[in-house]
């Protein structure tokens, strides 16, 4: 079965910005990768990045800098200042479209006891959906 | 059809404000994010940012991240974007123009650009 | 920033002539690349999207091709009324950034 994983980290240099981590455990090919916060896309949560695999990238505030790390994992920047920033227990999502397995929906926010600089490993994140 | 009616020439003071207007008709306001160029002579075309009108969601190019703010009315199809605190080098022809907001549409580009608008910041 | 990087500042060419103006980016942006063509005091038009197709009303003598890092706008028989500035445009990530332009004019 696909696995979605996600991991949130806050930076040292920057404590109020994060960085989000989010990659597919799949044999599929990879079509769309929408990450958001608040919760999952579509079902309350704000899209922050769409990435496409051919066409790019689209980032809305207060994304900084989205990137595809590898075929199967995107990272994603976030701000630290501003009115729209994140705070340690928002929640971010990453969805993952592929072929043939469909979409796949993991969740996850900052360890509660992390340490700047510090993340959990990345491992499955605990709500996992497949549309 | 497809139009994006800009706001007239400005003529404005060093230090002073200004708000440029892009009056979007012929197609569904909320289906295509309304991105922002600058163009002059020295640097060509630059990219200032966007804003999704159905959502108010914005992206900046970091560059001209507290010169400019986008904003957006849905209720009159208009997209805005001020300019603060103006130098000579802001005097530029500023653009608007949009691009469909789903990755996955199949034309996917700046397929219509507004006739611009010029900016002279002079004292 | 990537960096879209138009070499050619300004191409000589007769009418029915075929010309190719280039563009290379920085790092590899696949085929997130537009075309434009612009005219003197008029605004940019859109000519080529996603690196190789038209826009709609776009001559055929326009052809885009290219992946990954180079990319080519081929004009076959240049009309008079081709004379204008190209620019290539990336949309592969933020900011979106464009080429120099290159001038197409008259030998």
């Known amino acids: 079965t696909p696995e979605v994983w996600v991991q949130v980290r806050m930076e040292a240099t920057e404590l109020s910005s994060f960085t989000i981590r989010c990659g597919f455990l799949g044999s599929g090919s990879i079509s769309l990768v929408t990450v958001s916060w608040g919760g999952p896309n579509g079902a309350g949560g704000t899209t922050l990045a769409v990435l496409h695999p051919e066409r790019g990238i689209r980032q809305w505030a207060p994304a900084r800098q989205a990137r595809w790390e590898t075929q199967s994992s995107i990272s994603l920047i976030l701000e630290g200042s501003g009115a729209s920033s994140p705070c340690a227990n928002t929640t971010f999502c990453c969805k993952f479209a592929s072929f043939p397995e469909g979409s796949w929906e993991a969740c996850g926010s900052l360890p509660p006891s992390s340490d700047p600089g510090l993340s959990a490993p990345p491992t499955p994140a605990p709500i996992l959906r497949a549309d | 059809q497809v139009q994006l009616q800009q706001s007239g020439a400005e003529l404005v003071r060093p230090g002073a404000s200004v708000t440029l207007s892009c009056k979007a008709s012929?197609?569904?306001?909320?289906?295509?994010?309304m991105h922002w160029v600058k163009q002059t002579p020295v640097h060509g075309l630059e990219w200032i940012g966007a804003?999704?009108?159905?959502?108010?969601?914005?992206a900046y190019n970091q560059k001209f991240k507290g010169k400019a703010i986008l904003t957006a009315d849905k209720s009159s199809s208009t997209a805005y974007m001020e300019l603060r605190s103006l130098t000579s080098e802001d005097s530029a022809v500023y653009y608007c123009?949009?691009?469909?907001?789903?990755?996955?549409?199949?034309?996917?580009?700046?397929?219509?650009w507004g006739q611009g608008t010029t900016l002279t910041v002079s004292s | 920033d990537i960096v879209m990087t138009q070499s050619q500042k300004f191409m000589s060419t007769s009418v029915g002539d075929r010309v190719s103006i280039t563009c290379k980016a920085s790092q590899n942006v696949r085929t997130a690349v537009a075309w434009y063509q612009q005219k003197p005091g008029q605004s940019p038009k859109a000519l080529i999207y996603l690196a190789s197709n038209r826009h709609t009303g776009v001559p055929d003598r326009f052809t885009g091709s290219g992946s990954g890092t180079d990319f080519t706008l081929t004009i076959s028989n240049v009309q008079s009324e081709d004379l204008a500035d190209y620019f290539c445009?990336?949309?592969?990530?933020?900011?979106?950034?464009f080429g120099a332009g290159t001038k197409l004019e008259l030998k």
């Open positions: 445009l990336q949309h592969w990530n933020y900011p979106l950034t």
């Open positions: 804003i999704d009108p159905e959502t108010g969601g914005t």
């Open positions: 123009t949009r691009w469909i907001t789903t990755v996955v549409a199949t034309l996917y580009y700046f397929d219509y």
């Open positions: 012929g197609y569904t306001f909320t289906d295509y994010e």
